[in-house]
Amino acid sequence: TQDTFRGSVLEGVLPGTSVMQVTATDEDDAIYTYNGVVAYSIHSQEPKDPHDLMFTIHRSTGTISVISSGLDREKVPEYTLTIQATDMDGDGSTTTAVAVVEILDANDNAPMFDPQKYEAHVPENAVGHEVQRLTVTDLDAPNSPAWRATYLIMGGDDGDHFTITTHPESNQGILTTRKGLDFEAKNQHTLYVEVTNEAPFVLKLPTSTATIVVHVEDVNEAPVF
């Protein structure tokens, strides 16, 4: 016997989307009498967010479907439904089971820079020097493609002096020098970095941009003939 069932559904789906099916068996006759005819109902839902009727169950098949809009993994990632199965087509003996519905993540949250402005100091001529770590927050599921950040230098790097990579654990953007900077040629660079996710957004979301002012520090260089 099974008294706990699991199912899953993507956040943001439309009402009517099927989630899972639960089944209860009854050895009594279901052809000539109603003794073995099972009727299903949802007794309770936890949590009751955004309200207490997010799901419905088909009375005779036990198929659970979404009945309301508003499934949001970032607010409620999992629901627990108490299901009742009653024989005699709903007028007889009742047994209960639990259905756990996991709300799957969609990339419906953009990563956001926090902070959005940085100042850094870099000695001239240093190659592979870590300039700055950029921090983002993302409400999607941690360590998923919808959470992992992808950074792009959008402007300010005319000489292709900089590169940015994503730290695999912290999700920070690590800005480093690709080639040496020349204090005498340009002592300040203002970079504009945009962040998106590995996974595409499921809806149109504004992208976050950070500004990094990089001050190049003079290094005493030997005279050249």
Epitope: T1, Q2, D3, T4, R6, G7, S8, E46, P47, D49, R73, E74, K75, V76, P77, E78, T80, V98, V100, E102, T137, L139, D140, A141, P142, N143, W147
Partner: antibody, heavy 118, light 113 residues
Framework: QVQLQESGPGLVKPSETLSLTCTVS????????WSWFRQPAGKGLEWIGR???????NYNPSLKSRVTMSVDTSKNQFSLKLSSVTAADTAVYYC????????????WGQGTLVTVSS | DIVMTQSPDSLAVSLGERATINCKSS????????????LAWYQQKPGQPPKLLIY???TRESGVPDRFSGSGSGTDFTLTISSLQAEDVAVYYC?????????FGQGTKLEIK
């Protein structure tokens, strides 16, 4: 490295409310489930309930009528209140982080002993 | 609730020998949609919180020595320590997370013979 630390009174009188707070450091409280457990001396582990960073809760049905959990994301803390306590509620109480949205617990507090006695 | 039953309650094994702990669930914890068993194993030493060893029945948590392994599916699971070390003395718990009402086995106390 994520660290959790339970705090609260070690002694509670019968019929009163047990209140504990778990402070999370080294990581954000956002996008995770946070659970409370208890373990009477020499006994096994009992799950009390969990709260998501949004404030959404699930409680152990056997304790549901007495349990309230809350979260304060600005302080990176979550809390447990257990009302109408008796001597049977004497235990070491642990807070823990759920791994993803599963009921796997990868980070735990060191635990705090709460004794219910007059 | 899903009831978890461990056997034996206590176990004494010689250093370097194999230790085997069994866990049985009152219903299947295998989710057919992702073919994963929602079962974990924890180690708890005196005065310490539990430590996650194994999840999805057989996946070792990062940093856990490879002498620890998990196996099984459906309702029957096993934790094996291939060569017992002194630091492995502890109580071991299985836990199901198939249901939101998380439940643990009663624990198996592992000692050195």
């Amino acid at each position: 490295q994520v660290q959790l630390q339970e705090s609260g009174p070690g002694l509670v009188k019968p019929s009163e409310t047990l209140s504990l707070t778990c402070t999370v450091s080294g990581g954000s409280i956002s996008s995770y489930y946070w659970s409370w457990f208890r373990q009477p001396a020499g006994k096994g582990l009992e799950w009390i309930g969990r709260i998501y960073s949004s404030g959404s809760t699930n409680y152990n049905p056997s304790l549901k009528s007495r349990v309230t959990m809350s979260v304060d994301t600005s302080k990176n803390q979550f809390s447990l209140k257990l009302s109408s306590v008796t001597a049977a509620d004497t235990a070491v109480y642990y807070c823990a982080r759920g791994m993803g949205v599963t009921g796997l617990f990868d980070y735990w507090g060191q635990g705090t002993l709460v004794t219910v006695s007059s | 609730d899903i009831v978890m039953t461990q056997s034996p309650d206590s176990l004494a094994v010689s250093l370097g020998e194999r230790a085997t702990i069994n866990c049985k669930s009152s219903q299947s914890v295998l989710y057919s949609s992702n073919n994963k068993n929602y079962l974990a194993w924890y180690q708890q030493k005196p005065g310490q919180p539990p430590k996650l060893l194994i999840y999805w029945a057989s996946t070792r948590e990062s940093g856990v020595p490879d002498r620890f392994s998990g196996s099984g599916s459906g309702t029957d699971f096993t934790l094996t320590i291939s060569s017992l070390q002194a630091e492995d003395v502890a109580v071991y718990y299985c836990q199901q997370y198939y249901s939101t009402m998380y439940t643990f086995g009663q624990g198996t106390k592992l000692e050195i013979k």
